[in-house]
Each structure stands twice: as structure tokens, then as C-alpha cells.
């Protein structure tokens, strides 16, 4: 069974998938569509890297642009370095500016919804 066939079989169960499962899926050429991606738990999507999301979505990665202001895409973009987002060539905006450090302060993030940044 190839990645696409596997994805069709598990698609309806993905809504509650944890990050670990999404990372694993990203290695299986599943080409997840944006309709499915948008239904994933935000907390499961946030830890994914740009490379992992690119692999998870395959050719559908271009769809991130259309959803850049909607959750979970918006919140995921806020967690990525702008340099990394730029590698996708989609014109995505809102990433962490170059030269900033990201402090993963759980309380700060829980209160504000965004990571704490320290300027250069």
C-alpha cells in the first residue's frame, strides 16, 4: 500500500492525531490535503517544522498561503522562523524575524498565545 492509499484509509481518524503521528506521516508521502490539515489539533501542528509540514502536505503545501490567517496555519506560522518560511516560496508572512531568539516559556505562551521573542 502506497502513502496515498494509506492516507485515504486513515484520513477520517486524523482529527485527534498527536504530533508524533503527524511527524511519522510526514515520512510516508501521504500528500495531506489542506481540508484535512485544517481539521488537525492546533497543539499537534505547532511543533512541526517547516520541512515536516512540507513533506506532510507534499504538493498541497501551496495551500498554506490561502489559509495563512486561519488556525492552525496562522499559529503554526507564528512559531516558524521567517527564513524557513521563505524557503517555501509562497509569500507567507508572520514568522519569527531573523536574529531573534525563541524562548519556549510555557506560561508566557499559554497567556499570550505566541512565543516569547528576544531581539538581537
Amino acid at each position: 500500500m502506497n502513502g496515498s492509499e494509506y492516507f485515504v484509509k486513515i484520513q477520517s481518524f486524523l482529527g485527534g492525531a498527536p504530533t508524533e503521528d503527524l511527524k511519522a506521516l510526514s515520512q510516508q508521502n501521504v500528500s495531506m490535503d489542506l481540508a484535512t490539515f485544517m481539521k488537525l489539533r492546533t497543539d499537534a501542528v505547532l511543533p512541526l517544522t517547516v520541512a515536516e509540514v512540507q513533506k506532510l502536505l507534499g504538493p498541497h503545501v501551496e495551500g498554506l498561503k490561502a489559509e495563512e490567517r486561519h488556525r492552525p496555519v496562522r499559529d503554526w506560522i507564528l512559531r516558524q522562523r521567517q527564513d524557513d518560511l521563505d524557503t517555501l516560496g509562497l509569500g507567507l508572512q508572520g514568522g519569527i524575524p531573523n536574529g531573534y531568539l525563541v524562548l519556549d516559556l510555557s506560561m508566557q505562551e499559554a497567556l499570550s498565545g505566541t512565543p516569547c521573542l528576544l531581539g538581537p
Epitope: 489542506l34 481540508a35 485544517m38 495551500g63 498561503k65 490561502a66 489559509e67 488556525r71 509569500g91
Partner: antibody
Framework: DVQLQQSGPELVEPGASVRIPCKAA????????VDWVKQSHGQSLEWIGD????????IYNQKFEGKATLTVDTSSSTAYMELRSLTSEDTAVYFC????????????WGQGTTLTVSS | QVVLTQSPAIMSASPGEKVTLTCGAS???????LYWYQQKPGSSPKLWIY???NLASGVPARFSGSGSGTSYSLTISSMEAEDAASYFC?????????FGGGTKVEIK
């Protein structure tokens, strides 16, 4: 056959509010955002905003913040736009349109609801 | 916001004539985010061209689109009566999404 069905014309007084429904049929409702567009005097089009049926999260054109509120009811596959504090400037045709998640552009439109604000 | 300027605002063409409509953007766009819609009086807009140059389903092959950066165009290679309508360009490259003022194409 994809359909976006809007309500008929509305005549309302200045200062009032109105809620315009857009009922979807013929597609999986949660696979599409619903966008709203204003057309004044049969002229140009203005994007008001869109709403995601999975999260009920709406994005607005800053010009319409505070004027429009976009919501969805997934149980009835219906999107709503409420317009408040109406003035003559709000007299226009309002369209709902669907946009597939992850895609740009609106591949299907409602027939439009004509709103007239007059005392 | 990105302002889209269409020209001409209104034009008349004879059957068989070549027609070119232009859409200029106030800042550079990624071409895949530029779309065109056709609208006839009393009707809703219809998706006509997507990603600058791709024809939507059911659009006749006499239509074409091109452009990049800040300059885009829609061309009708041979005008027909059914092409009489208003055409709007639309960008979703940046928020808020915007439309051009439209070009009304009439048949002579």
C-alpha cells in the same frame, strides 16, 4: 450540483442590523471557507472577509471590522453575515462565495442579497 | 493594501476583434495569486481565469491570461457576443484581498 442559496432583498432602516444567510448544498461544507463580497451600484467588488467552518474563525477586511460579523452553523451548512449600525453606505448587493480550503479564488457564488438602507 | 487598477473602464469591440484588458497592481504579486472573474448584469461573478493564465472550467479557449509582477492582462482572441460582460481582476497575494474596478466589455 453546488449551490449557495442566499435570502431575498432586504429593506431596513438606518441604525438597524440585518443577518444574511447563505445555505450551502452539493459539497462537503467543512471543506470550504465561506467568503463575503460587497458590490455597490453594480460596480466594483469589495472583499469583506471569510469564515472557516471547522473553527468558526473569521478573518475580516479591516474596513469591515465592527461592521460585519461572520459565523457558520455547520449543522445546517449555513453561513451568516450580520451587518450592524446600518447607513446608506451599506446599500449594496452582498454575495457569499465558497473557497476550497487551501485554494484561492471563489469557484461558486450565491445569487446575491440586495440590501437597501433607507428610512 | 494592494490596489488593482483596470483599464479601460469600458470598451466596445466588434465580433471577431481581439480584445485586451489590463490589470495593474500597486505592488508586485506572486502570479499564482492573481485571478479574473466575469460578471453579467443581474448575475453573480464567475471564476474565469485562475493563477494568471489558467482557464476555469467551461471557459472558451479564445480567452487567455498572462502577466507577472505588477502587470497582468486578459485577452479575448476573437470577440463573440456572449463575451459582453464586466471582467474583474482579483488578488489574494496579501490581505485584504482586493478586486480591480472592472472593465465593461460591450459588443458593437
Amino acid at each position: 450540483d453546488v449551490q449557495l442559496q442566499q435570502s431575498g432583498p432586504e429593506l431596513v432602516e438606518p441604525g438597524a442590523s440585518v443577518r444574511i444567510p447563505c445555505k450551502a448544498a452539493g459539497h462537503t461544507f467543512t471543506d470550504y471557507n465561506v467568503d463575503w463580497v460587497k458590490q455597490s451600484h453594480g460596480q466594483s467588488l469589495e472583499w469583506i472577509g471569510d469564515v472557516n467552518p471547522n473553527t468558526d474563525g473569521a478573518i475580516y477586511n479591516q474596513k469591515f471590522e465592527g461592521k460585519a460579523t461572520l459565523t457558520v452553523d455547520t449543522s445546517s451548512s449555513t453561513a451568516y453575515m450580520e451587518l450592524r449600525s446600518l447607513t446608506s453606505e451599506d446599500t449594496a448587493v452582498y454575495f457569499c462565495a465558497r473557497r476550497r480550503l487551501g485554494q484561492g479564488g471563489f469557484d461558486s457564488w450565491g445569487q446575491g442579497t440586495t440590501l437597501t438602507v433607507s428610512s | 493594501q494592494v490596489v488593482l487598477t483596470q483599464s479601460p473602464a469600458i470598451m466596445s469591440a466588434s465580433p471577431g476583434e481581439k480584445v485586451t484588458l489590463t490589470c495593474g497592481a500597486s505592488s508586485s504579486l506572486i502570479s499564482k495569486y492573481l485571478y479574473w472573474y466575469q460578471q453579467k448584469p443581474g448575475s453573480s461573478p464567475k471564476l474565469w481565469i485562475y493563477s494568471t493564465s489558467n482557464l476555469a472550467s467551461g471557459v472558451p479557449a479564445r480567452f487567455s491570461g498572462s502577466g507577472s509582477g505588477t502587470s497582468y492582462s486578459l485577452t479575448i482572441s476573437s470577440m463573440e457576443a456572449e463575451d459582453a460582460a464586466s471582467y474583474f481582476c482579483h488578488q489574494w497575494s496579501s490581505y485584504p484581498y482586493t478586486f480591480g474596478g472592472g472593465t465593461k466589455v460591450e459588443i458593437k
